[in-house]
């Protein structure tokens, strides 16, 4: 009489995470009497996956009704597959023994590989803002994918970047993998509206890569340029001095007027105008009563932008009987600020 053989026809099975894996196994004989068990791995540390005889295996169902007398199909289904389920599964026939059943014959094994999608890439930029011409680093991370092969690309405004380094961990065999990439980006003054994109392509994504983005508006700081100008007003004893704050980002800005070094007014940028490149302009006016001064006045526009050290621009106001226009304001976007007279 031919000896029982345990047949596992599939050398390998590939299943997407979340789906059900079918592991096939048939015996060639009903004899010897005894149960079938499924294990993951071989040797003393093997993990019991299913025992026909006893136990509770909520994720496992049998393909056939094992209580039927002539059943020789011991295939199983494992539901809700995760990358942790990857491994080689063995269908093992036991023969009844005293007091314990004895392993009789094992199948050749079926390797279960799990295809798991990478998580959505998360792009993070530097902790502190940087100014144009500086190089900043962005990182991109994605986790939980299998198999290990993966492609990562960086883009800035649709243009592919080349200065980046990528690592896939772990280096050896694992149930799932993670990717970590760092890209270097040189900032320009026009980058307020720019985006950095990390794109991950994997076999599980069927040609539709995942993308993570970072807005450079959260990374860049464009320092303002200052221009102080003076023009006459209708009242002969008053002079209008304007401080034009141009091309700054972000909006957080505080302006202080100094008169001969003494603080005369401090205000915070509120009603700003936005340029096409995403930077802002703002203008502050100071109305100076010339008659209150016998000597020339040094007016200083001091700006503290985004918590950085203050920058300033000064203007010497000549006190004379007939003040002349000493500069013109050509900025079309001026919105002005609170008008205050200094007496």
């Amino acid at each position: 009489e031919e000896e029982l053989q345990v047949i596992q026809p599939d050398k390998s099975v590939l299943v997407a995470a979340g789906e059900t894996a079918t592991l096939r196994c048939t015996a060639t004989s009903l004899i010897p009497v005894g149960p079938i068990q499924w294990f993951r791995g071989a040797g003393p540390g093997r993990e019991l996956i299913y025992n026909q005889k006893e136990g509770h295996f909520p994720r496992v169902t049998t393909v056939s009704d094992l209580t039927k007398r002539n059943n020789m199909d011991f295939s199983i289904r494992i539901g809700n597959i995760t990358p942790a389920d990857a491994g080689t599964y063995y269908c093992v026939k036991f023969r009844k023994g005293s007091p314990d059943d004895v392993e009789f014959k094992s199948g050749a094994g079926t390797e279960l590989s799990v295809r798991a999608k990478p998580s959505a890439p998360v792009v993070s930029g530097p902790a502190a803002r940087a100014t144009p011409q500086h190089t900043v680093s962005f990182t991109c991370e994605s986790h939980g994918f299998s198999p290990r092969d993966i492609t990562l690309k960086w883009f800035k405004n649709g243009n592919e970047l080349s200065d980046f380094q990528t690592n896939v961990d772990p280096v050896g065999e694992s149930v799932s993998y993670s990717i970590h990439s760092t890209a270097k980006v040189v900032l320009t003054r026009e980058d307020v509206h720019s985006q950095v994109i990390c794109e991950v392509a994997h076999v599980t994504l069927q040609g539709d890569p995942l993308r993570g983005t970072a807005n450079l508006s959260e990374t860049i700081r464009v320092p303002p340029t200052l221009e102080v100008t003076q023009q006459p007003v209708r009242a002969e004893n008053q002079v209008n001095v304007t401080c034009q704050v141009r091309k700054f980002y972000p909006q957080r800005l505080q302006l202080t007027w100094l008169e001969n070094g003494n603080v005369s007014r401090t205000e915070t940028a509120s009603t700003v105008t936005e340029n096409k490149d995403g930077t802002y302009n703002w203008m502050s006016w100071l109305l100076v009563n010339v008659s209150a001064h016998r000597d020339d006045v040094k007016l200083t526009c001091q700006v503290e932008h985004d918590g950085q050290p203050a920058v300033s621009k000064s203007h010497d106001l000549k006190v004379s009987a007939h003040p002349k226009e000493q500069g013109s304001n050509t900025a079309a976007e001026n919105t002005g600020s609170n008008e205050r007279n200094i007496y």
């Epitope: 026909q52 009704d65 209580t67 002539n70």
Partner: antibody, heavy 131, light 103 residues
Framework: AVTLDESGGGLQTPGGALSLVCKAS????????MGWVRQAPGKGLEFVAG??????????TYGAAVNGRATISRDNGQSTVRLQLNNLRAEDTGIYFC??????????????????????WGHGTEVIVSS | AVTQPASVSANLGETVKITCSGD???YGWYQQKAPGSAPVTLI????KRPSNIPSRFSGSKSGSTATLTITGVQADDEAVYYC??????????FGAGTTLTVL
């Protein structure tokens, strides 16, 4: 007619061994699964051991209470099935019935098991384990 | 494990059903009129009846529950009824028995 005659019962001492024999007639013995069922005083039926028609030690099965102490065997030429029970205990006391299944099991086909398909019983032999 | 009711009762001539539940595909039903006496097979393989058993005894199985039906119960039917099956380890199991009382 199918007849099953048990023998070998009687008074046994604890720790000893007994050998029960069932002599079958009236059917093609080697085509059928055979088994032993017992009944302790005041208790229900209990499966003791079974042997499939395929024969050999690879086609035997034992109840939990006797597993490791019992051996069932068959002699198709003599149409007998034997139950050997070692290390006897007081709880082995009872009537031991020989049972014939309605079919047999070969390597590739099983018409019957035992407890779900007994179609003939012997009259039983009484075993008393006592010192 | 096999579960069956400890006792059932029926009036003479009535139909009585005894159930047995367990994790198996096949069940047998055995009648024992006195403790220690040889059991009699009423039904094997769920619904097969030996030729010497009256047709008022019938067996059926639905899902994991087997049922022995006795139609037109007679006084002589008073006995203990056992169901038997095989567990997943090919070991025979018998229920604890159901005592039928005919009123």
């Amino acid at each position: 007619a199918v007849t099953l005659d048990e023998s070998g019962g009687g008074l046994q001492t604890p720790g000893g061994a007994l050998s029960l024999v069932c002599k079958a007639s009236g059917f093609t013995f080697n085509s059928y699964n055979m088994g032993w069922v017992r009944q302790a005083p005041g208790k229900g039926l209990e499966f003791v051991a079974g042997i499939y028609s395929a024969g050999g030690d690879t086609s035997t099965t034992y109840g939990a209470a006797v597993n490791g102490r019992a051996t069932i065997s068959r002699d198709n030429g003599q149409s007998t099935v034997r139950l050997q029970l070692n290390n006897l205990r007081a709880e082995d006391t009872g009537i031991y019935f020989c049972a014939k299944a309605a079919g047999g099991c070969t390597a590739h086909n099983c018409d019957a098991y035992i407890a779900d398909s007994i179609d003939a019983w012997g009259h039983g032999t009484e075993v008393i384990v006592s010192s | 494990a096999v579960t069956q009711p400890a006792s059932v009762s029926a009036n003479l001539g009535e139909t009585v059903k005894i159930t047995c539940s367990g994790d198996s595909s096949y069940y047998g039903w055995y009648q024992q009129k006195a403790p220690g006496s040889a059991p009699v097979t009423l039904i094997y393989d769920n619904d097969k009846r030996p030729s010497n058993i009256p047709s008022r005894f019938s067996g059926s199985k639905s899902g994991s529950t087997a049922t022995l039906t006795i139609t037109g119960v007679q006084a002589d039917d008073e006995a203990v009824y056992y169901c038997g099956n095989e567990d997943m380890n090919y070991v025979g199991i018998f229920g604890a028995g159901t005592t039928l009382t005919v009123l």
